[in-house]
Amino acid sequence: TVPPMVNVTRSNASEGNITVTCRASSFYPRNIILTWRQDGVSLSHDTQQWGDVLPDGNGTYQTWVATRICRGEEQRFTCYMEHSGNHSTHPVPS
């Protein structure tokens, strides 16, 4: 088992909004849960976009999940990752 490296980034979207993206990379096996939480509970699936789980060329995998949020509300969101029985949560950078 190779645990993922998780990285959260933010980018400008429409005015007043930002897109936050949570990337998991360099993990094996390929089964992974990557999702956003808002106010400590699951963010509805229809407001999240997931990338495919793809090989990264080193025998490991990578994927991502993104959502659009209101600027100034970053503190309400965390990215949750679960892989091979281990899990972690990752805040949006300031």
């Epitope: 849960i33 106010d39 400590g40 509970v41 699951s42 509300e73 503190q75 309400r76 679960e82 029985g85 899990h87």
Partner: antibody
Framework: DVQLQGSGPGLVKPSQSLSLTCSVT???????YYWNWIRQFPGNKLEWM?????????NYNPSLKNRISITRDTSKNQFFLKLSSVTTEDTATYYC???DGRGAWFAYWAQGTLVTVSA | DIQMTQSPASLSASVGETVTITCRAS??????LAWYQQKQGKSPQLLVY???TLADGVPSRFSGSGSGTQYSLKINSLQPEDFGNYYC?????????FGAGTKVEIK
């Protein structure tokens, strides 16, 4: 370390409003986290009532309809529960509790405040 | 709303025994589950979150497991201080709801 302490009257008359205070020490309620009220009925059933967040937004249990209000006084680092039009069914032990944005589990609880609704 | 059904409602066990408490959600809660212990006259205390992770200071004889709609809390080698009420709680969505509780008594 953060501490929460609930307080308020132990007896409320039917049709009146129930008002409770949660005083927080060791952490500013505007910095982070979600500041909740939970009650436990006789017979031990637990019910989440709602929260006020670090930013001042609310989320309430729909079962309480329009009877509930959670507010705060940031200068005193306190948050409050107001439950209107109470009946004997609102007799319970009321807890204030905190969770953080990683997940809505309650790691910090105040001691309970028993509130009896009776004429 | 997601309903949480706990079983058994009560159980009697001896010190040193292993006990298992189960919690069933009315929908898939994807491991968004916490367990609490409550002693008589005290506030609930967090034991487990994210279905499997022990809270700080919780002894390793406690363990959480499960997925989907079915979850369990196991206590290996029950100790005298473990007697009390246990509750599950989901945090998949609002409103947050708790199970009705399991009372663990001394046999």
């Amino acid at each position: 370390d953060v501490q929460l302490q609930g307080s308020g009257p132990g007896l409320v008359k039917p049709s009146q409003s129930l008002s409770l205070t949660c005083s927080v020490t060791g952490y500013s309620i505007t910095n982070d986290y979600y500041w909740n009220w939970i009650r436990q009925f006789p017979g031990n059933k637990l019910e989440w009532m709602g929260f006020i967040s670090f930013g001042g937004s609310n989320n309430y249990n729909p079962s309480l309809k329009n009877r509930i209000s959670i507010t705060r006084d940031t200068s005193k680092n306190q948050f409050f529960l107001k439950l209107s039009s109470v009946t004997t069914e609102d007799t319970a032990t009321y807890y204030c509790a905190r969770y953080d944005g990683r997940g809505a589990w309650f790691a910090y609880w105040a001691q309970g405040t028993l509130v009896t609704v009776s004429a | 709303d997601i309903q949480m059904t706990q079983s058994p409602a009560s159980l009697s066990a001896s010190v040193g025994e292993t006990v298992t408490i189960t919690c069933r959600a009315s929908g898939n809660i994807h491991n968004y589950l916490a367990w609490y212990q409550q002693k008589q006259g005290k506030s609930p205390q967090l034991l487990v979150y994210d279905a499997i992770t022990l809270a700080d200071g919780v002894p390793s004889r406690f363990s959480g497991s499960g997925s989907g709609t079915q979850y369990s809390l196991k206590i290996n080698s029950l100790q005298p201080e473990d007697f009390g009420n246990y509750y599950c709680q989901h945090f998949w969505s609002f409103p947050l709801t708790f199970g009705a509780g399991t009372k663990v008594e001394i046999k």
